[in-house]
């Protein structure tokens, strides 16, 4: 009979969900790398597809500074980024599938700490929820690594050398080569967070030029060779 069918249907009714957030206790990553901070949630609003805002903050729940915020229009999986601190944070999860997982690029030691995810339903079902315990991000130091070394043409038929290294703490760079005292001529500039670049502005002699990167965790070096052939300036690296 009809009531029997209806009872059978009701037996398959979705269990009433309540607000909850699932985050791991800790995420570990090395400086210079990227990390994913997982965060999934359940909510009591069945299949909500109204406007929503996803927020991540650091330090403490509810009051800590926001590092990321995005908003999705009704029915949309596209969460438009409104805030991404230093442009290094982006939503990896699908908020419509209750996933607020966040990717953090170019990690620095200073990024270590607790992060808290929050979701806000801003439509008819006006409601919000934030993780209380958060996920602890541990960024570990990284030994130096030289990522690029090159010789480039400079002014007045001269040549200059560039060396870019990464590490955390940021490594100190030094050039050495065939010209006496040329290491003191290296111009060192801070790059993006964990990357640094040093320039040797004028390569006056042929030979081997070595870039050394060092921090408290170790050192790395790489070399480039300059040979100017008779008849026309040129390099061999």
């Amino acid at each position: 009979d009809a009531s029997g069918d209806l009872l059978n249907t009701e037996a398959h009714s979705a269990p009433a969900q309540r607000w909850s957030m699932q985050v791991p206790a800790e995420v570990n990553a090395e400086a210079g790398d990227a990390a994913v901070l997982p965060c999934t949630f359940t909510h009591p609003h069945r299949h909500y597809d109204g406007p929503l805002t996803a927020i991540w903050r650091s330090g403490e729940p509810y009051a800590g500074p926001q590092v990321f915020r995005c908003t999705a229009a009704p029915g949309s999986e596209l969460c438009q980024t409104a805030l991404s601190l230093h442009g290094r944070f982006r939503l990896l999860g699908n908020p419509r599938r209750n996933d607020l997982s966040l990717r953090v690029e170019r990690l620095a030691l200073a990024d270590s700490g607790r992060y808290f995810c929050r979701v806000e339903f801003t439509g008819d079902a006006h409601d919000r929820y934030e993780s209380r315990h958060g996920v602890r991000l541990r960024v570990t130091a990284a030994a130096p690594r030289i990522v690029n070394i090159s010789v480039l043409p400079g002014p007045a038929h001269a040549f200059r050398a560039l060396c870019t290294a990464e590490g955390e703490p940021p490594p100190a760079l030094a050039w050495s080569g065939p010209a006496p005292g040329n290491s003191s001529a290296a111009l060192q500039g801070q790059g993006h967070g964990y990357q640094v670049t040093a320039e040797l502005p004028a390569l006056t002699r042929d030979g081997r030029y070595t870039c050394t990167a060092a921090n408290s965790l170790g050192r790395a070096e790489a070399s480039v060779y300059l040979f100017r052939f008779h008849g026309a300036p040129g390099t061999s690296t």
């Epitope: 249907t9 009714s13 069945r46 229009a73 029915g75 999986e77 969460c79 599938r97």
Partner: antibody, heavy 120, light 106 residues
Framework: EVQLQQSGAELVRPGASVKLSCTAS????????MHWVKERPEQGLEWIGR????????EYDPKFQGKATMTADTSSNTAYLQFSSLTSEDTAVYYC?????????????WGQGTLVTVSA | QIILTQSPAIMSASPGEKVTMTCSAS?????MHWYQQKPGTSPKRWIF???KLASGVPGRFIGSGSGTSYSLTISTMEAEDAATYYC?????????FGGGTKLEIK
């Protein structure tokens, strides 16, 4: 087991209306959106719209606004799609689809489809 | 509305061959979803959230892409993969499908 059982094929005259049904078993339709999708051989798949059977909230593709009417009856666990002022362009297979079990992807379960043929 | 353009419309591949089909969106999307349909049957969800395989989908299927450009790749074609594949977006109402890529076996 989750299933969507759609009503049988329809042969209708131009200008007439048709009402298709989709009865769900294995879950309660009020807990999930029900969608309707149109399939024509050369046009592929088109999303018509979705209904929230619990409160009747509806979202249509503007292309089908005024042409399609979605309703649902939670007591019989059935969703309906009514098409009006039929033309040859409405000749297609119509699927009802649910987002049940959306953790594993949208449009989890599809009905077997109902073929609607509009012909004089 | 976001228009999804799939290419090629029809393609054929030999068993063991690598197959790639693309889906281009007229506006940026966060994710792309893919469905497989064989003649006379209802579509099946195949790949969701751009790269996640639906339950039962073989690991030779790979979804990738971002923004406006997405692709579905089959690392080694098998006879059972012959079907029509549709991409689908939910980044803006109205939700839309691509026109489909029909993959045939040589």
């Amino acid at each position: 087991e989750v299933q969507l059982q759609q009503s049988g094929a329809e042969l209708v005259r131009p200008g007439a209306s048709v009402k298709l049904s989709c009865t769900a078993s294995g879950f309660n339709i009020k807990d999930y959106y029900m969608h309707w999708v149109k399939e024509r051989p050369e046009q592929g798949l088109e999303w018509i719209g979705r209904i929230d059977p619990e409160d009747g909230d509806i979202e249509y593709d503007p292309k089908f606004q005024g042409k399609a009417t979605m309703t649902a009856d939670t007591s019989s666990n059935t969703a309906y799609l009514q098409f009006s002022s039929l033309t040859s362009e409405d000749t297609a297979v119509y699927y009802c689809v649910t987002d049940y079990d959306y953790d594993g992807g949208w449009f989890a379960y599809w009905g077997q489809g109902t073929l609607v043929t509009v012909s004089a | 509305q976001i228009i999804l353009t799939q290419s090629p419309a029809i393609m054929s591949a030999s068993p063991g061959e690598k197959v790639t089909m693309t889906c281009s969106a007229s506006s940026s999307t966060s994710f792309m979803h893919w469905y497989q349909q064989k003649p006379g049957t209802s579509p099946k969800r195949w790949i969701f959230d751009t790269s996640k395989l639906a339950s039962g989908v073989p690991g030779r299927f790979i979804g990738s892409g971002s923004g406006t450009s997405y692709s579905l790749t089959i690392s080694t074609m098998e006879a059972e993969d012959a079907a029509t594949y549709y991409c689908h977006q939910r980044s803006a109402y109205p939700w839309t499908f691509g026109g489909g890529t029909k993959l045939e076996i040589k």
